[in-house]
Interface confidence: low
Amino acid sequence: MMTGTIETTGNISAEKGGSIILQCHLSSTTAQVTQVNWEQQDQLLAICNADLGWHISPSFKDRVAPGPGLGLTLQSLTVNDTGEYFCIYHTYPDGTYTGRIFLEVLESSVAEHGARFQIP
């Protein structure tokens, strides 16, 4: 039985040219995290494997940085970065947990969080 839950940064906004930390947190389970995938719609951005460490997709290497923790930092944001992002936690023995984040990249200089993530 999958008892875990994923908390995410939720719906967030950021300014064009700036950066954003995408963060997910898996709680309420003792399952072991074996790998976390970060995906944007149908594109793989990065993988954090418990044994092998990080892999950043070559096409994103200049704009994506691993961390903090299992999170992902997107840099030099463009309006085209607006969209859905998914953190996919592969765990044993539970299986797969998925969290969704919606990022809106704004031209305005007043981009603020719609919701703020907090590790419990």
């Epitope: 704009r63 691993p66 961390g67 981009a111």
Partner: antibody
């Protein structure tokens, strides 16, 4: 274990040049944005330069733009800071720093600019 | 350019005391980009709190961060000897990335 080891600091006269190096180990260097951050004798922290993981993007504050150049050699896991037209206000402890926001700092190397 | 002002510059606290220090931005900033570092004498800074309220790895649970807009704070619920250090706030969003002047926390 993550390690960042800076080298190349020293005493330089105003107007002079110097190149700092940082040897990185314990992580996949090419994945990470890297920066140089300095700490003045008054203990203030100042961001100096940043370079993206692939080296394609660089960023500088106005006070060092045109004088300092950040670069990296991902094959050797090395980060560099070439400094020229040095001024007395550049005197500081220079840290090599991983990611932004910085999640790991080296021990620093000292630059003194004085006649 | 965002200017970060930390207050107080120096403070002292007794063991077990609750401690709060503040970081004030010259104009409103997103909580996403406000971070804190701890530095002890003779050592490099350590990543302490990121995105206003999230503890970095290994940071004791007695630390917390909060804030929004122009006002941010770091709180220690019960001061311990190992907490004596200088704490810097940091704004990282768009260049130039700036640091506050630091709050030096001493043991009373």
């Amino acid at each position: 274990e993550v390690m960042l080891v800076e080298s190349g600091g020293g005493l330089v006269k105003p107007g002079g040049s110097l190149k700092l190096s940082c040897a990185a180990s314990g992580f996949t260097f090419s994945f990470y944005t890297m920066s140089w951050v300095r700490q003045t004798p008054e203990k203030r922290l100042e961001w100096v330069a940043t370079i993206s993981g692939g080296g394609g993007d660089t960023y500088y504050p106005d006070n060092v733009k045109g004088r300092f150049t950040i670069s990296r050699d991902n094959a050797k896991n090395n980060l560099y800071l070439q400094m020229s037209s040095l001024r007395s206000e550049d005197t500081a402890l220079y840290y090599c720093a991983r990611s932004l926001p910085v999640d790991f700092w080296g021990q620093g190397t000292t630059l003194t600019v004085s006649s | 350019q965002i200017v970060l002002t930390q207050s107080p510059a120096i403070m002292s606290a007794s063991l077990g005391e609750r401690v709060t220090m503040t970081c004030t931005a010259s104009s409103s900033v997103s909580s996403t980009y406000l971070h804190w570092y701890q530095q002890k004498p003779g050592s490099s800074p350590k990543f302490w709190i990121y995105s206003t309220s999230n503890m970095a790895s290994g940071v004791p649970a007695r630390f917390s961060g909060s804030g929004s807009g122009t006002s941010y704070s770091l709180t220690i619920s019960s001061m311990e000897a190992e907490d004596a250090a200088t704490y810097y706030c940091h704004y990282y969003h768009r260049s130039p990335y700036t640091f506050g002047g630091g709050t030096k926390l001493e043991i009373k």
